[in-house]
Interface confidence: low
């Protein structure tokens, strides 16, 4: 880019207000008015202290996914529009977002889009389209309480029944034995397990660098209850929003790294 110091055409970031239910994908569109030869497009979230925290970036023919893989930037075929998506939005993703573009190299023109607001609402249990209101029987809160208490009681009864059946079937079950899943056996995902989302890099020619995985936790015998708590993300740096899904696994090099493998 021989002369990037021409006035920058405005960026747009839409929609200005977006509401999604938790678990759904939230997608903004960042649009460039023209396509410079060399540029970086950053996606930011505005922190409570009015700081811009970079979520992900796009540059040239590479995508930097950012530290939280839920934040995706996808260039659309027209070359000017970019989808900026939060995969499986969480309640604490609610906030102000914007995109910023930078002509490369300097005279570096740094331009930010107008802000847009994302509201992530709690997922409602009922289907959104309901039949006309039935005649009032119980108030909503009371009805919820009754359902909740009933569910708990049923659950407890089922648990007791299951315990009794197990005790009857396996009267000599070993005590204190520690059964640990083998390292090469994947964790079984129940219906409520957080999904693992893969970033589609298309045909980008990444060489992957491994982040050292946490060693498996030691087994603790002589216990009757086992809970597996997984902390997949590395600790957030001060002033940044921690995110449980910022994976500590393999990460592609950031876009500026060039094709070499980092670190050596």
């Amino acid at each position: 880019l021989d002369s990037p110091d021409r006035p920058w055409s405005p960026l747009t970031f839409s929609p200005a207000q977006l509401t999604v239910q938790e678990g759904e994908n939230a997608t903004f569109t960042c649009s460039l008015a023209d396509i410079p030869d060399s540029f970086v497009l950053n996606w930011y979230r505005l922190s409570p202290r009015n700081q811009t925290d970079k979520l992900a970036a796009f540059q040239e023919d590479r995508i930097e996914p950012g530290r939280d893989r839920r934040f995706r930037v996808t260039r659309l075929p027209n070359g000017r529009d970019f989808h900026m998506s939060i995969v499986a939005a969480r309640l604490n993703d609610s906030g102000i977002y914007l995109c910023g573009a930078i002509y490369l190299p300097p005279n570096t023109q740094i331009n930010e889009s107008p802000r847009a607001e994302l509201s992530v609402t709690e997922r409602t249990l009922e289907p959104p389209t309901q039949s006309p209101s039935p005649p009032p029987r119980l108030s909503g809160q009371l009805q919820g309480l009754v359902i909740g208490v009933t569910s708990v009681l049923v659950g407890v009864l089922l648990l007791l029944l299951l315990t009794w059946v197990l005790a009857a079937v396996f009267p000599r079950a070993t005590r204190g034995a520690c059964v640990c899943g083998s390292e090469d056996e994947p964790l079984k995902e129940g219906p409520d397990a957080a999904p693992v989302f893969t970033l589609d890099y298309g045909e980008l020619d990444f060489q992957w660098r491994e982040k050292t995985p946490e060693p498996p936790a030691p087994c603790a015998p002589e216990q009757t209850e086992y809970a597996t708590i997984v902390f997949p993300g590395r600790p957030a740096s001060p002033g940044r929003r921690a995110s449980a899904s910022s994976l500590q696994g393999a990460q592609p090099p950031s876009p500026e790294d060039g094709p070499g493998l980092w670190p050596l």
Epitope: V40, D53, E60, L104, P105, D205, S237, E256, G258, P259
Partner: antibody, heavy 118, light 113 residues
Amino acid sequence: EVQLVQSGAEVKKPGASVKVSCKASGYTFTSFWMNWVRLAPGAGLEWIGRVDPYDSETHYNQKFKDRAILTVDTSTSTAYMELSSLRAGDIAVYYCATQFGFSWLAYWGQGTLVTVSA
Amino acid sequence: EIVMTQSPGSLAGSAGESVSINCKSSQSLLYSSNQKNYLAWYQQKPGESPKLLIYWASTRESGVPDRFSGSGSGTDFTLTINNLQAEDVGVYYCQQYYSNPYTFGQGTKLEIK
């Protein structure tokens, strides 16, 4: 206007450590890697390493891996390069340089002369 | 690491003429995925910090006169300065940003006759 302002010249004894600072302004400090390069008399430019102010991730030139420590203070938009076990061969002008995007070095500090003398 | 070799070590040119500086890398700097050469050229005037002239081997930095041009691909690169001016004196460096560690050529000192 992007500016990188480095700390003043230092004179150190062999075996000591030196910590050079680089205060950035005019851009979002946490968005771009900060590189450190030195120019020794009679030698060419030598890349020491770089730090990502976003999360303090570092990449070092293997030659300096055991002696150089690159850090940042995002609250003041300042990057630091500490070099330990100084010897005569470390006499050089040390530069900080911001890479915008890919790894060419677009903005450079004014340089800090480090002298090692008994 | 990738070794960058510049030639000549020094040269002198007259005002108004053209000079060329060569840079050779020990391995290709052309990245097949995007067909870009990961090479930059810098100018360092006496008593000043280095200044970026060229990146992607041939793309001129903003504000750099068009007298400066970069060419080459793979392992062989050239910086050409046309219509040499007195203010062009200094040391010129090539740099690869293909892989860790980034490495520079040893520099070429340019003087005006």
